[in-house]
């Protein structure tokens, strides 16, 4: 969210997406109400080819990296304001995500649903 | 790794102005930038934050409205552009690079050497 | 806002001493607390992050410590290079608030 002012409170802020290729498309920003949430990054790369980077807030958030046959997940989980800003870059064209989307349905989701 | 910031002068109240700061010796695009200030009584407060793309801004309440941070990466600049300058903005003007220890964690690791605003009639 | 409380603005010391400096903190904020030096120049420097973490080319003499709302930066064996006003800073939450300020003096 661009211009984004403060507003009181202590919900922790983070960036918030689902499924992009760049950190540039992930610029929504989260208020994460409930208490003990964290900001969490996933980042899915299919066989080489391609990053996907989804973001937000997760209540059970906890580091991991696992392989897949199609690919490898990393999360990444942090407790600041605006902590999950980075992710990796993506190097290839968004049409090549839609023909890769079904094989890493699974994957591209939150941690609470991984 | 430097950064250099110009652009400060004496301006009338009301009067609006931009800073800018040179960025030299590292990837500028890579790092989120903010401006800092401090004012006469030699207290430090942020007034603006911005991610690596230039994408995403951040203000405190006490400077919303007023402040515009930017940033131009393929000349390695950062902006700030002040309007409706009042008399409590009076300060000497830092920018910085955050840079990020951990998943969670991250300081402010370089700062340029400051340009003086002075706002008076 | 959380408020960033170093009671003591300035402080007077002699070489060779041994000086703390102390920050509070209106809430708890996890260690993400950093400490600044800027010189009478006005020139500022990193010198702690993460509470305790020296900052590439700061001298062992800077130490940190603290944690949930008390931190404390520690010189030992103070220099001449030394004299500076030093600032804490937090990382938690927005919008990141600095400490006043303390001034060290030489007696």
């Known amino acids: 969210m661009a211009g984004l002012a403060l507003q009181p409170g202590t919900a922790l802020l983070c960036y918030s997406c689902k499924a992009q290729v760049s950190n540039e498309d992930c610029l929504q920003v989260e208020n994460c109400t409930q208490l003990g949430e964290q900001c969490w990054t996933a980042r899915i790369r299919a066989v080489g080819l391609l990053t996907v980077i989804s973001k937000g807030c997760s209540l059970n958030c906890v580091d991991d990296s696992q392989d897949y046959y199609v690919g490898k997940k990393n999360i990444t989980c942090c407790d600041t304001d605006l902590c999950n800003a980075s992710g990796a870059h993506a190097l290839q064209p968004a049409a090549a995500i839609l023909a890769l989307l079904p094989a890493l349905g699974l994957l591209l989701w939150g941690p609470g649903q991984l | 790794v430097q950064l250099q910031e110009s652009g400060g002068v004496l301006v009338q109240p009301g009067g609006s102005l931009k800073l800018s700061c040179a960025a030299s010796g590292f990837t500028f695009s890579s790092y989120s930038m903010s401006w800092i200030r401090q004012t006469p009584d030699r207290r430090l407060e942020w007034v603006a934050y911005i991610n690596d793309s230039g994408g995403s801004t951040f203000y405190p309440d006490t400077v919303k409205g007023r402040f515009s941070i930017s940033r131009d990466n393929a000349k390695n600049t950062l902006y700030l552009q002040i309007s409706r300058l009042r008399s409590g903005d009076t300060a000497i003007y830092y920018c910085?690079?955050?840079?990020?220890?951990?998943?969670?964690?991250?300081?402010?690791?370089?700062w340029g050497a400051g340009t003086t605003v002075t706002v008076s009639s | 806002d959380i408020v960033m409380t170093q009671s003591t603005s300035s402080l007077s010391a002699s070489l060779g001493d041994r000086v703390t400096i102390n920050c509070g903190t209106s809430q708890d904020i996890n260690n993400y607390l950093n400490w600044y030096q800027q010189k009478p120049d006005g020139s500022v420097k990193l010198l702690i992050y993460y509470t305790s973490r020296l900052h590439s080319g700061v001298p062992s003499r800077f130490s940190g410590s603290g944690s949930g709302t008390d931190y404390s930066l520690t010189i030992s064996n103070l220099e001449q290079g030394d004299i500076a006003t030093y600032f804490c800073?937090?990382?938690?939450?927005?919008?990141?608030?600095f400490g006043g300020g303390t001034k060290l003096e030489l007696k």
């Open positions: 910085s690079r955050r840079m990020y220890y951990g998943n969670s964690h991250w300081h402010f690791d370089v």
């Open positions: 800073q937090q990382s938690k939450t927005l919008p990141w608030t």
